[in-house]
């Protein structure tokens, strides 16, 4: 039994890190493998993760890590029974993938403006709370080519767009994701999408 693709890990920088790897052949990850991890600053505590399958040869492990701080570094040991398959380390602050924004809502009754709001997924005392910026994806449900991305480079979790910039009488969907530039993070997953009907009518022009 051997590791084909070494574990790579990302952290939500609040309580959870996720590591994924590929084995050399079909593997029952939960029955055959264990990922042992220790906080270097508190190596008296040995934590063990039971991986799940992610495809026939792929494994994924969800590592619970409380009270993360920037200096935290973890040792990782991947075991198959008594056989050590791989050793590595992981510094959560250097591999951040934020949690997805939550509670995306579209308000269509604000004059001729669409107001989109969502929730920052972090509590105010978390380091990422004031570091997130966002991207909002809006698309026409019936026309995949009618899709656009709005970069929200300010921290307020809102976006206002003119209803007139979208086609009238069409159902649209929106979703939002986040990233933390100062942590050199990757983008979060997209939030669940929300749907609305763009009922905006162009005003009649007088000739």
């Amino acid at each position: 039994m051997k590791v084909l693709q070494e574990p790579t890990c990302v952290s939500d920088y609040i309580s959870l890190s996720t590591c994924e790897w590929k084995m050399g052949g079909p593997t029952n990850c939960s029955a055959e493998l264990r990922l042992v991890y220790q906080l270097v600053f508190l190596i008296s505590e040995t934590n063990m993760c039971v991986p799940e399958n992610n495809g026939a040869a792929g494994c994924v492990c969800h590592l619970f890590m409380e009270d993360m701080v920037g200096a935290d570094n973890y040792t990782l040991d991947l075991w198959a029974g008594q056989q050590l398959l791989w050793k590595g380390s992981f510094k959560p602050s250097e591999h951040v993938k934020p949690k997805a924004p939550e509670n995306l809502t579209v308000y269509t009754n604000v004059s001729e403006t669409l107001l989109l709001t969502w929730s920052n997924p972090y509590p105010p005392d978390n380091y990422l709370y004031e570091k997130l910026t966002y991207a909002v994806n809006i698309w026409n449900e019936n026309d995949p080519t009618d899709s656009r991305i709005y970069d929200v480079t300010y921290q307020e979790p809102t976006l206002r767009i003119a209803a007139s910039t979208l086609k009238s009488g069409v159902s649209y969907r929106a979703r939002v994701r986040a990233w933390a530039q100062s942590y050199n993070s990757t983008w979060s997953e997209w939030s669940p999408s929300t749907k609305w009907y763009n009922a905006y009518k162009e005003p009649f022009e007088k000739h």
């Epitope: 508190l42 505590e45 040995t46 040991d77």
Partner: antibody
Framework: EVQLVESGGGLVQPGGSLRLSCAAS????????MSWVRQAPGKGLEWVGI???????DYASWAKGRFTISRDNSKNTLYLQMNSLRAEDTAVYYC???????????WGQGTLVTVSS | DIQMTQSPSSLSASVGDRVTITCRAS????????LSWYQQKPGKAPKLLIY???KVASGVPSRFSGSGSGTDFTLTISSLQPEDFATYYC??????????FGQGTKVEIK
């Protein structure tokens, strides 16, 4: 039976060196964190140092530079190398396995180190 | 340096007495609960009684209990038995691999 057995203690002159051993049975040192703890005669317990399952080591501030923890996986044995010994290092030295929530869950019987001229 | 201060340093009690020992840390222990208690008899190795501030270790009689959080912790023996006469130590765990012990509390027969 799960147990830890220390050995290697004895009389050593100031400035000398000594290596203590802790043989483990019933547990695999590769998957456990282990510490050394000492107790001077008639005194309290004092943590010396630790080795994690990954092999990472750390020490009490006073032990850094003089004491070194290692392990031999093939012998399932933990070691404490002590150099530049002083009279105040005279103590019973225990090895201990860490259990839940950083506790010292399992202790050896201890080995006495006497530093004297 | 982080200090763990136990009180009292010694106490005299009778069989059947309720005994309380306190441990005060100079800083909050890791996760506010990484505090353990140990019993040591003369010439013997320490034995784990309580871990995570209040969890009773396997094989330890139910008359032993622990409580507290952060910096202030208590070990209680609800009804002292002859075999409980010993020295008791608290120990904390801290980020940075710091594991200080209290100075000990000797429980003697009155």
């Amino acid at each position: 039976e799960v147990q830890l057995v220390e050995s290697g203690g004895g009389l050593v002159q100031p400035g000398g060196s000594l290596r203590l051993s802790c043989a483990a049975s019933g547990i695999d040192l590769r998957t456990n964190s282990m510490s050394w703890v000492r107790q001077a005669p008639g005194k309290g317990l004092e943590w010396v140092g630790i080795i994690g399952s990954s092999g990472y080591m750390d020490y009490a501030s006073w032990a850094k530079g003089r004491f070194t923890i290692s392990r031999d996986n093939s012998k399932n044995t933990l070691y404490l190398q002590m150099n530049s010994l002083r009279a105040e290092d005279t103590a019973v030295y225990y090895c201990a396995r860490h259990g839940d929530s950083s506790s010292f869950a399992l202790w050896g019987q201890g080995t006495l180190v006497t530093v004297s001229s | 340096d982080i200090q763990m201060t136990q009180s009292p340093s010694s106490l005299s009690a009778s069989v059947g007495d309720r005994v309380t020992i306190t441990c005060r840390a100079s800083e909050s222990v890791y996760k506010n609960n990484r505090l353990s208690w140990y019993q040591q008899k003369p010439g013997k190795a320490p034995k784990l009684l309580i871990y995570e501030a209040s969890k009773v270790a396997s094989g330890v009689p139910s008359r032993f209990s622990g409580s507290g959080s952060g910096t202030d912790f208590t070990l209680t023996i609800s009804s002292l038995q002859p075999e409980d006469f010993a020295t008791y130590y608290c120990a904390g765990a801290y980020r940075g691999n710091i594991y200080p012990f209290g100075q000990g509390t000797k429980v003697e027969i009155k």
